[in-house]
Interface confidence: medium
């Protein structure tokens, strides 16, 4: 064991001697080329700074792409859904829209007058929601309660009409008791020609310039796009 320790000690001494001489050589080199080392450090500092700037630019670009990723993914997801179902499955709804029984719905978080709400829906290639059944009514109220919310029913030209041309007379209705009353007592000027869903789900005809939340609706078709 003593012999083994002796051998290890010799080996360590030899290694230390080699280290010392190589270190001495390097120290001498540094003394000789001190100026160029300083230059190297400055150059490396500049490189590092540039890399940091590039990294920040990449980071900003990544954030930007992440922000728009969901929108760009919209059509890819719809096409995938269509392919998986061999074309039989209806396509998915756009980002921020809610799918329900063949339609896509968008629920506002702010208010507009009826005409402006309808205009907004049209720019989304949609229309104010047309309520065709108790089931659809229930779905809408679940998403709009406790807010008064515009729907796509108006009698601005004298007779009640749904914005998508759905027949009013033979279709589902959910008027509140005593409504529609075309009330003039609101001191807002003009009659009540537009319909809003109240928090309890009942419909009320209201002054069209009132500012309420709104719901847009668009039908889905089987071509891979939202109609």
């Amino acid at each position: 064991q003593s012999a083994q320790l002796q051998a290890e000690l010799r080996s360590l001494k030899e290694a230390f001697s080699n280290f010392s001489s190589s270190t001495l050589t390097e120290v001498q080199a540094i003394s000789t080329h001190g100026g160029s080392v300083g230059d190297k450090i400055t150059s490396l500092g500049a490189k590092l700074e540039k890399q940091q700037q590039d990294l920040k630019a990449d980071h900003d670009a990544l954030l930007f792409h992440l922000k728009h990723f969901p929108v760009d993914l919209r059509f890819v997801a719809c096409q995938m859904e269509l392919l998986h179902s061999n074309g039989s499955q209806r396509t998915c709804c756009p980002v921020n829209w809610v799918e329900h029984q063949g339609s896509c719905y968008w629920f506002s978080h702010s208010g507009k007058a009826w005409a402006e709400a309808e205009k907004y829906c049209q720019l989304e290639n949609a229309h104010l929601v047309v309520i065709n059944s108790w089931e659809e009514q229930k779905f809408i109220v679940q998403h709009t309660n406790p807010f008064n919310t515009w729907i796509g029913l108006t009698d601005s030209d004298g007779s009640w009409k749904w914005v998508d041309g759905t027949d009013y007379r033979h279709n589902y209705k959910n008027w509140a008791v005593t409504q529609p009353d075309n009330w003039h007592g609101h001191e807002l000027g003009g009659s009540e020609d537009c319909v809003e869903v109240q928090p309890d789900g009942r419909w009320n005809d209201d002054f069209c310039l009132q500012v309420y939340r709104w719901v847009c609706e668009k039908r889905r078709n089987a071509t891979g796009e939202v109609a």
Epitope: V71, P94, S110, L123, N125, V211
Partner: antibody, heavy 121, light 107 residues
Framework: QVQLVESGGGVVQPGRSLRLSCAAS????????MHWVRQTPGKGLEWVAI????????YYADSVKGRFTISRDNSKNTLYLQMNSLRAEDTAVYYC??????????????WGQGTTVTVSS | DIQMTQSPSSRSASVGDRVTITCQAS??????LNWCQQKPGKALKLLIY???TLETGVPSRFSGSGSGTDFTFTISSVQPEDIATYYC?????????FGQGTRLEIK
Amino acid sequence: QVQLVESGGGVVQPGRSLRLSCAASGFTFSSYGMHWVRQTPGKGLEWVAIISYVGKNKYYADSVKGRFTISRDNSKNTLYLQMNSLRAEDTAVYYCARRGNSYGGYGMDVWGQGTTVTVSS
Amino acid sequence: DIQMTQSPSSRSASVGDRVTITCQASQDISNYLNWCQQKPGKALKLLIYDASTLETGVPSRFSGSGSGTDFTFTISSVQPEDIATYYCQQYDNVPITFGQGTRLEIK
């Protein structure tokens, strides 16, 4: 990256026509509504028109209604502004801009560099 | 149409100064307000949307606040690269309308 490049501007006589184009790249053009906006030293920035992402619905400023037509070709990633019956007051730098995804609004989030239209006899 | 009144029309500031620009809408526009920056010969750049949300990649020295009719845009510590004209823009409704702009100069 997201880019909008306008072209088609120039000098034109009053009463004549001009068509501006806006080439879009770096995003899914067919997913976004698009605007035209113009800028003059006198009147500042003035919104001109908006078109929905499928191109079906369009709205115009009163000052251009009946004279200008906004349209788009999603297969070419291009937005257009057809300007007829041009007047001296239509002289401006015209920008195309992308409609952002703000919840319920019509704001712009990306703008082009602009193309200059001068209406003069 | 909704009128947007922006003030001041120009402002001179030193590097490091806090600068505030105000914008008033002629009717309630909720939080449908953008703040944009325009440098000479460059495209307009969105800085703030929905009145107070910072656009991706925009330095945090820029901020916005307000709702309804009164809005404020602030640069907490002006930098030389902030020399530009700043615009407020309502997008509650078409026609979309803009403020007259505020030209920022560095002393």
